[in-house]
């Protein structure tokens, strides 16, 4: 994922309850791997900006056949305001880019932790 | 390994103003948050308040009415905690501590503690 | 601002005893817990986190249960390093806060 700094608000913001289960969640996969995750599916990169939660879920939403990641499929769909289906793609995809889904949750969990402890201290 | 690493021991008299800085290494500053901690001689912990190092954004414990500044300094992965209008309650050991709240929990390092005499 | 309220405040054990402390939060805090142990003189050290997650290097002899409100720290088997003041601490929101310790004294 691209632009970890000067990121936009994430529009829509969850609640810190929803955002600290979503961060459990990522946190939980990236403990828990073992074999490659996904065996090793590559996915768009995205930016971590406006419409984060939407577009992060376009790029998991074509993995299929993969259960860890199915969790953290059903929690973005409830932070993204529409419909996400496969094979959709917005402008965050850096669509010149593809990563495996490891190094995706990774930099997807490095980000929401910044924006958890920002909306825990502003 | 994280290090924490506090300022020496502080006398001050009553209604002056203590600074206490919290060096850090071993990991990247802005990742954690980081917190502070009072504890008066045989009693209890007390938090005092925390920062967020990267937006410099803090929540404070209104048990100190404002009396509580927690700074950080990126350029030298630095925290600093100031306490005013100092009184005999405030006799205490600070501490700094920090950690990754969803990874071993917020104060999971601690520094060494800082002991802070207040006495006219 | 939610209350940690810890008992007993102390107890006199012996080295072998399982000991059990707990911690009642003033309302439901998600098992966004921890527990400490301090030493005189010493800063706390963390052995638990999230209710029942043991922090890395902390012997498998000490470990913590419960949920909503209700949680427990255990000793399983007490070893003599482990004479100390532990105390819980709330961060499911602000201001986090601790609960007035428990000393474990040798009976």
């Known amino acids: 994922l691209t632009c970890l700094g000067g990121f936009a608000s994430p529009g829509p913001v969850p609640p810190s309850t929803a955002l600290r289960e979503l961060i459990e969640e990522l946190v939980n996969i990236t403990q828990n791997q073992k074999a490659p995750l996904c065996n090793g599916s590559m996915v768009w990169s995205i930016n971590l900006t406006a419409g984060m939660y939407c577009a992060a879920l376009e790029s998991l939403i074509n993995v299929s056949g993969c259960s860890a990641i199915e969790k953290t499929q059903r929690m973005l769909s409830g932070f993204c305001p529409h419909k996400v289906s496969a094979g959709q793609f917005s402008s965050l995809h850096v669509r010149d880019t593809k990563i495996e889904v490891a190094q995706f949750v990774k930099d997807l969990l490095l980000h929401l932790k910044k924006l958890f402890r920002e909306g825990q201290f502003n | 390994e994280v290090q924490l690493v506090q300022s020496g021991a502080e006398v001050k008299k009553p209604g002056a103003t203590v600074k206490i800085s919290c060096k850090v290494s071993?990991?990247?500053?802005?990742?954690?948050?980081m917190h502070w901690v009072q504890q008066a001689p045989g009693k209890g912990l007390e938090w005092m308040g925390g920062?967020?190092?990267?937006?410099?954004?803090?929540a404070s414990n209104q048990k100190f009415k404002g009396r509580v500044t927690i700074t950080a300094d990126k350029s030298t992965d630095t925290a600093y905690m100031e306490l005013s209008s100092l009184r005999s309650e405030d006799t205490a050991v600070y501490y700094c501590?920090?950690?990754?709240?969803f990874g071993g929990g917020p104060f999971a390092y601690w520094g060494q503690g800082t002991l802070v005499t207040v006495s006219s | 601002d939610i209350q940690m309220t810890q008992s007993p405040s102390s107890l006199s054990a012996s080295v072998g005893d399982r000991v059990t402390i707990t911690c009642k939060a003033s309302?439901?805090?998600?098992?966004?817990l921890s527990w400490f142990q301090q030493k005189p003189g010493k800063a706390p050290k963390s052995l638990i986190y999230?209710?029942?997650r043991l922090v890395d290097g902390v012997p498998s002899r000490f470990s913590g249960s419960g949920s909503g409100t209700d949680f427990t720290l255990t000793i399983s088997s007490l070893q003599p390093e482990d004479f100390a003041t532990y105390y819980c601490?709330?961060?499911?929101?602000?201001?986090?806060?601790f609960g007035g310790g428990t000393k474990v004294e040798i009976k």
């Open positions: 501590t920090t950690g990754d709240y």
């Open positions: 071993g990991y990247t500053f802005t990742d954690y948050e």
């Open positions: 920062i967020d190092p990267e937006t410099g954004g803090t």
């Open positions: 309302q439901d805090i998600n098992s966004y």
């Open positions: 999230r209710a029942n």
């Open positions: 601490l709330q961060y499911d929101e602000f201001p986090y806060t």
